[in-house]
């Protein structure tokens, strides 16, 4: 059976697969997924290993028409480094010389300057090039190699291993060499995999059942540390409760060096955030932190300094803390917009069972703003999801130069932000450099400001506008309002009408359905339309909604189904990657973000068309 990293190298024109007959004879044969000699896998960014021989594909020299054979894997050798060139060409790195079969009656695979069909290779059974099954470095735990990555294949007691092994052990713990020759270098670490006993790598907090892994002997950059946690279905540590900080202070008290945690300000336009998307509501900075020096965008916990936090450059090499297990944030359920008949008094706007109102003209200090909202039967607004925030920005008449009080504050417990309406803090969206909580100005209250409506802490005594929110009152059967310029069942936003397609459809089917409605799969022109769409679909239970974006026509170039330029993107992390496909919007915790899916997957979708009676603005000229 093929494991997910293994593949057969297939030439479509010959309809044959590469076959390692022996280390000195790499040829082709009829494809057979059970033949070990046809299985290959990437063992570094640029090396391809034969699974049968645990040797790497290479050449004797970077010259035209030399045989490709198998060599002992050497990550430093220039003659073993391969790369995918445009589309399905496979070539030796840095040269226009390609992996080729079929010329001059040659039985062997050759390195050749020709880039025709016989130099084009795919993963057998797919339309993907070889790089789509690329190498993912596996960061080790414990051992003696400071958390370095596994080196596959590695030699132990004169035997080669292409995977983690329990050789030399009687307890089943899996390990790997971190250089290709363990026997000489004696460097190794344990693999971040599930095996009997691997739970002892974690400390479980008996109070919350959350588990923590302290990797104090590792030396990784912040991004490497995060990857290591993710390889164990975990994330870099987030701390949202005072109890959690206390537990970790105890857990790390015997250590002295800094440890990476998930706090960062890597997002270009927003402020401090946790990598696991937990709300940033508890602050425990070291005095003098966070320093405003550019580049210091990642945060370490300092065991030697009472486990307080310090921002550093992300490329520094430190130990790190991973966290996994049930988070307390899931217990607060926000009703989906479609579940709640929402009736509001005049001048209040409905959304997901609540009513909202911006008071822009009567400026008030935070305390007085709160009193006014409470007199009106509500509270200063709490915001629990990106969808709710995007509703406020896109549909309440929020303006880019607004600065408005919301209900978040740390008046009760310093450095621990809470909502004034008592609902749990499940989401935060701070402005770049926020929360700054400058001590010389007690900044205990929070405003929404700027074009994106992100948040900043502020002294509570400033007179500002504010946003109130109250529970809506149900009034018998809901009346479906037909929005001016849109048919029944369509929702209007600016110049367009939108409709959710409720049948699970492939991308092509969804596109056809929209066309049948004299509409098209939605385009997304800017941040504000994205905000509207996020609030429109983001709280729904389905995972994905098709948009009109895909790279079906030209692989690697994403285009809308209608002739409109792609001027705005909202990719999820690791997207679009190298995968070709069609683009759908996520819901839930990653609400609104774009993922590339296989176009024949089934999802719901959003159709869009010009509202009736709207004058089309002229197309922008460039």
């Amino acid at each position: 059976l093929l494991d997910t990293r293994q593949f057969l190298i297939y030439n479509e024109d010959h309809k044959r697969c590469v076959d390692a007959v022996s280390p000195s004879a790499v040829q082709t044969a009829a494809c057979n997924q059970d033949a070990e000699s046809q299985k290959f896998r990437w063992v570094s960014e640029s090396q391809i290993m034969s699974v049968a021989f645990k040797l790497c594909l290479g050449v004797p020299s970077k010259t035209d028409w030399v045989a490709i054979t198998l060599y002992a894997c050497d990550s430093k050798s220039e003659f073993q480094k391969w790369e995918c060139k445009n589309d399905t060409l496979l070539g030796i790195k840095g040269e226009d010389l390609f992996f080729n079969y079929g010329n001059r009656q040659e039985k062997n695979i050759m390195l050749y300057k020709g880039s025709g069909l016989w130099s084009r290779w795919k993963i057998y059974g797919t339309t993907d090039n070889l790089c789509s099954r690329g190498y993912e470095a596996m960061y080790t735990l414990l051992g003696n190699a400071n958390g370095a990555t596994c080196a596959f294949p590695f030699k132990f007691e004169n035997k080669w291993y292409a995977d983690c092994t329990s050789a030399g052990r009687s307890d089943g713990w899996l390990w790997c060499g971190t250089t290709t020759d363990y026997d000489t270098d004696k460097l190794f670490g344990y693999c971040p995999l599930k095996f009997e006993g691997s739970e002892s790598l974690w400390n479980k907090d008996p109070l919350t059942s959350v588990s923590y892994q302290i990797n104090s002997k590792s030396a990784l950059t912040w991004h490497q540390a995060r990857k290591s946690c993710q390889q164990q279905n975990a994330e870099l540590l987030s701390i949202t409760e005072i109890h959690e900080q206390t537990y970790l202070t105890g857990l790390t008290s015997s250590l002295t060096s800094g440890l990476w945690i998930g706090l960062n300000s890597l997002s270009f336009n927003s402020g401090w955030q946790w990598s696991d998307r937990s709300p940033f509501r508890y602050l425990n900075w070291l005095p003098g932190s966070p320093s405003a020096e550019p580049g210091k965008s990642c945060v370490s916990l300092n065991p030697g300094k009472n486990a307080k936090w310090e921002n550093l450059e992300c490329v520094q090499k430190l130990g790190y803390i991973c966290k996994k297990g049930n988070t307390t944030l899931n217990s607060f359920v926000i009703p989906s917009e479609s579940d709640v008949p929402t009736h509001c008094p005049s001048q209040w706007w409905p959304y997901a069972g609540h009513c909202y109102k911006i008071h822009r003209d009567e400026k008030k200090i935070q305390r007085d703003a709160l009193t006014t909202c409470r007199k009106e039967g509500g509270d200063l607004t709490s915001i629990h999801t990106i969808e709710e925030l995007d509703f406020i920005i896109s549909q309440l008449g929020y303006e880019p130069n607004d600065e408005l009080w919301i209900g978040l504050n740390d008046i009760k417990i310093q450095m621990y932000f809470e909502w004034s309406d008592g609902t749990p803090v499940t989401f935060t969206k701070w402005l770049r450099g926020e929360p700054s909580h400058e001590n010389n100005r007690q900044e205990d209250c929070v405003v929404m400001k700027g074009k994106d409506g992100y948040w900043a802490d502020r002294g509570c005594e400033w007179p500002l506008g504010y946003i109130c929110k109250m529970k809506s009152r149900s009034q018998g059967p809901e009346i479906v309002e037909v929005e001016k310029g849109c048919r029944k069942g369509w929702k209007k936003h600016h110049f367009y009408c939108y409709m959710i397609g409720h049948t699970l459809s492939t991308f092509a089917e969804a596109n056809q359905t929209c066309n049948n409605e004299n509409a098209y799969l939605t385009t997304i022109e800017d941040r504000y339309e994205q905000a509207f769409l996020t609030s429109f679909v983001g709280l729904r239970p389905e995972k994905y909604f098709w948009t009109g974006l895909s790279d079906i026509q030209t692989k690697g170039t994403f285009q809308w189904t209608i002739e409109e330029e792609v001027r705005f993107t909202h990719w999820n992390s690791d997207m679009p990657g190298r995968k070709p496909g069609c683009v759908a919007m996520r819901t839930g915790i990653a609400g609104g973000l774009w993922d590339v899916l296989k176009c024949d997957e089934k999802a719901k979708f959003v159709c869009k068309h010009w509202a009736e009676g709207v004058t089309h603005p002229p197309k922008p000229t460039t």
């Epitope: 003696n144 052990r169 307890d171 713990w173 002892s200």
Partner: nanobody, 110 residues
């Protein structure tokens, strides 16, 4: 160590060094001219296992804080005469897991 038949003896074994965790500890014995055999073992969670020949007479226990394993031997018989070895299955700074004590001779004789 010389013990009378029917007598008792307690063996102890401590593991030291750069140890992350001890997954299991156990006692083995080798009588003259015979193969080494497992007598008793205990996991990090406290589960125990005994050879049939010592069940009800020997008790293995462990002090995790001290990385130490004990073997309490009661109702000793002449056939218990052997060199007793302790083994620790550890996670440490080499990939090898099994570390052995140097052995202690127990003689049961009147």
């Amino acid at each position: 160590q010389l013990v009378q038949p029917g007598g008792s003896l307690r063996l102890s074994c401590a593991a030291s060094g750069s140890i992350f965790t001890i997954n299991a500890m156990g006692w083995y014995r080798q009588a003259p001219g015979k193969q080494r055999e497992e007598v008793a073992a205990i996991t990090s969670g406290g589960s125990t296992n005994y050879a049939d020949s010592v069940k009800g007479r020997f008790t293995i226990s462990r002090d995790n804080a001290k990385n130490t394993v004990y073997l309490q031997m009661n109702s000793l018989k002449p056939e218990d005469t052997a060199v007793y070895y302790c083994k620790a299955v550890v996670v440490t700074t080499t990939p090898y897991s099994d570390y052995w004590g140097q052995g202690t001779l127990v003689t049961v004789s009147s």
